[in-house]
Amino acid sequence: MGRGVRVLLLLSLLHCAGGSEGRKTWRRRGQQPPPPPRTEAAPAAGQPVESFPLDFTAVEGNMDSFMAQVKSLAQSLYPCSAQQLNEDLRLHLLLNTSVTCNDGSPAGYYLKESRGSRRWLLFLEGGWYCFNRENCDSRYDTMRRLMSSRDWPRTRTGTGILSSQPEENPYWWNANMVFIPYCSSDVWSGASSKSEKNEYAFMGALIIQEVVRELLGRGLSGAKVLLLAGSSAGGTGVLLNVDRVAEQLEKLGYPAIQVRGLADSGWFLDNKQYRHTDCVDTITCAPTEAIRRGIRYWNGVVPERCRRQFQEGEEWNCFFGYKVYPTLRCPVFVVQWLFDEAQLTVDNVHLTGQPVQEGLRLYIQNLGRELRHTLKDVPASFAPACLSHEIIIRSHWTDVQVKGTSLPRALHCWDRSLHDSHKASKTPLKGCPVHLVDSCPWPHCNPSCPTVRDQFTGQEMNVAQFLMHMGFDMQTVAQPQGLEPSELLGMLSNGS
């Protein structure tokens, strides 16, 4: 397969959020574990009520019997509400038609209201970017949906964290769900409109502000918590916009709405590429150079407190999580695969199906180490040692665990920690961790990672096969664990 074809294929795989996941299969391994405890109680049919995480610490006597009764009650009530559940989010194009996609068509959002809830989840879609006329023209030809609203469907199905099914979304299933399609190609940072001089509009930052403004009239004004989430470029968009949203709500007279961020697969490193290439297209261009050019092209805006720290022309620094995160006021939960495919792509690492040479293997391992280091001072983080990209709107986002804790559970613990933050206690909640970063050093050393498929045969590979394919010498891998290679292979093959 030619390089260009492979890149296009990779891009299209990265773009089809919630669809077929390309090289990864999200499935449960063996027997399904019991779902994590729900953080919201199911509302009685026809009578939605706001609900809060249940705290059973006060329950005396037989906890098992109490929980059995709750489960039985929930099961008997669930069919009543399930019949009425419509998973679809409905498209609303912005009333203010001057806030547009790249091609001048109005931007918009998909909304599914949950009248009983005062929680609002606003999700920013991802999908790379373009940073000059040439690669934006090419993007318009091949990925128009990411530059125009003209062909958007009337509805979208909420998946993963946007799902209203408690089984699929034990974290926030009852929230008001908003999906904001990415059609500005500017990592949600732009503030420039289409004109005679500018062939394209880049209004990502303005789209978010306008969506928030319009949602205030649709019930957001009564919100208790607004969670701005996003994946990939949308994850970086969260870091760039979360404080501005909080500021906007404060200025509009809604200071009581707590704004938080959830950045998935948007925490990139401005590291040295594996092989340096000239900046000719989105994929080969080193991220620092792409963003440097992009900011000028988009009239990109970055958080003020970050901008202050860098010289004129150096604002690109603020697109990198580890530099912008410390300047943010709003709490942000960072989700990042330690071996992110998009990071590897911009670093010119292309896993072609051939066994990996030692130099590349060490580069990949070092990437995981560097990423882990940048997360050490991020109290709320979830970073599994997997080779993947994006997670939160995948249907099986509940499957991956770090140190025995799933992402929905970690997010629930984060909610609790923020709820309790006005109390003096600085210690993390017992048995409810929020800083979850894998410490094992190679890709897929975490057995709950999504299964890898061989890029060419389509066959599933178990972890042992994958590691050998990656050129890891089993002796080297087994030794630090105090194991024989055969024992390690057995353990990895069993997924333990």
């Epitope: 720290q309 860098f310 010289q311 300047t327 006021r329 709003c330 709490p331 923020l418």
Partner: antibody, heavy 121, light 113 residues
Amino acid sequence: QVQLKESGPGLVAPSQSLSITCTVSGFSLINFGVQWIRQPPGKGLEWLGVIWAGGRIKYNSTLMSRLSISKDNSKSQVFLKMNSLQTDDTAMYYCARDLGLNWDPPWFAYWGQGTLVTVSA
Amino acid sequence: DIVMSQSPSSLAVSVGEKVTMRCKSSQSLLYNSNQKNYLAWYQQKPGQSPKLLIYWASTRESGVPDRFTGSGSGTDFTLIISSVKAEDLAVYYCQQYDSYPPTFGGGTKLEIR
């Protein structure tokens, strides 16, 4: 350890200008900003301005027209210049380190010992 | 600009007594999204630079004795010295770091009887 030390002229005649240097050690001006604060004798503290790590500057709006802050990263020095001094500019002038990227505006954990500037004929 | 007011402007106490001083801001220093109050307290002993005691309204700077306690939220804040020692003779300032320019209160002068 983190240290800041101000050095200034001591005495300045009215309408003249003032130059103070803040020399830092234990950290780099590439990573941290430096803030200037003054305190008239027996009075409270007044923030004057900041030069951030990246070289951008912000001044107290009431003194903006008279103030100028600059730095030399390689020499670990920050400079405060103030012109058209009057007797009510008599004060102890302090430089203080900010918190880098972490919080801005900051609280001030590291201060210089201050340099007393007296404006008098 | 945010205006910071402190009271009392001075007070005299005996060693071992409990001292309470107050600081009021002209607008809320509580940032709702992270539940933090953007307020710090400093101690300035005669002839010395100010020394940081408390930030986030209630977090003690390392090395600061636990007899110093900060509390309050929004616009009203308090610094308490549970049992005054002779070495606590100083002027105490509060400072907001919610927005530029950072501003300080006029100070509370603590004298030992």
